[in-house]
Amino acid sequence: LVPHLGDREKRDSVCPQGKYIHPQNNSICCTKCHKGTYLYNDCPGPGQDTDCRECESGSFTASENHLRHCLSCSKCRKEMGQVEISSCTVDRDTVCGCRKNQYRHYWSENLFQCFNCSLCLNGTVHLSCQEKQNTVCTCHAGFFLRENECVSCSNCKKSLECTKLCLPQIENVKGTEDSGTT
């Protein structure tokens, strides 16, 4: 079976690499525009230049193209803690990232949020914080892990999953209460 190609891919595949088929005349292959530029006018004929113009400030194209407009530069999301790593140029979109000692949590493919790396207080670092993953902590005795923080077993309710980890402490508390009744 031949994979189904979109009209644009079908048209482009007729021309050699780096060229595209003229939208009004399928016997003409025009040279694509370089990155940092966009298509202002198709080439008038074979062997003639495509009219490409540089992207205006606030827009870019990152690869050779025959786009009628440049793409708008992304803005880093301050409300998500993002900072600008590098500014947008005519041939490269803005690069956003996180500050030092922070990691990215991806809510979706194109939305990440910056959070502080856990310090593992009352525990030890099992895996160091990485660009896309928080520190993995192992808690000291008498503490259990809740939302990647080591919390005292005195905060462990019987209904929570911490009961297994905090079982000796819970038994001790129960025993102390029981021994008070004679």
């Epitope: 949590h105 809510w107 979706s108 493919e109 194109n110 939305l111 939302e147």
Partner: nanobody, 116 residues
Framework: EVQLLESGGGLVQPGGSLRLSCAAS????????MHWVRQAPGKGLEWVSG????????YYADSVKGRFTISRDNSKNTLYLQMNSLRAEDTAVYYC?????????WGQGTLVTVSS
């Protein structure tokens, strides 16, 4: 058409509680992470909390951690924010938001005023 409708705001005394709700329609609610974002008078937007598609993970801004709880009911297409131990600095318009697709979608907001 995506619609987000917040409710539950109002005037509350410091130390009091409120529960905000957000009714969602026009998209598959259970397929999307959801967020609460607020804007205090004369200030910029501040992300408050977010929740994953199935109710996990949940994240909170440091300023509300331990006081606010985000939850969702996918069968009712509703997002919630339980706010306890409210402080004057929590006074803001609270927006329910679907973020991160080709477009962001916001509700019209609900005003929370914390004052004695």
């Amino acid at each position: 058409e995506v619609q987000l409708l917040e409710s539950g705001g109002g005037l509350v005394q410091p130390g009091g509680s409120l529960r905000l709700s957000c009714a969602a329609s026009g998209f598959t609610f259970g397929d999307e992470p959801m967020h609460w974002v607020r804007q205090a008078p004369g200030k910029g937007l501040e992300w408050v909390s977010g929740i994953g598609k199935e109710g996990q993970p949940t994240y909170y801004a440091d300023s509300v951690k331990g006081r606010f709880t985000i939850s969702r009911d996918n069968s009712k297409n509703t997002l919630y924010l339980q706010m306890n131990s409210l402080r004057a600095e929590d006074t803001a318009v609270y927006y329910c938001a679907k973020l991160g697709g080709p477009f962001d979608y916001w509700g019209q907001g609900t005003l929370v005023t914390v004052s004695s």
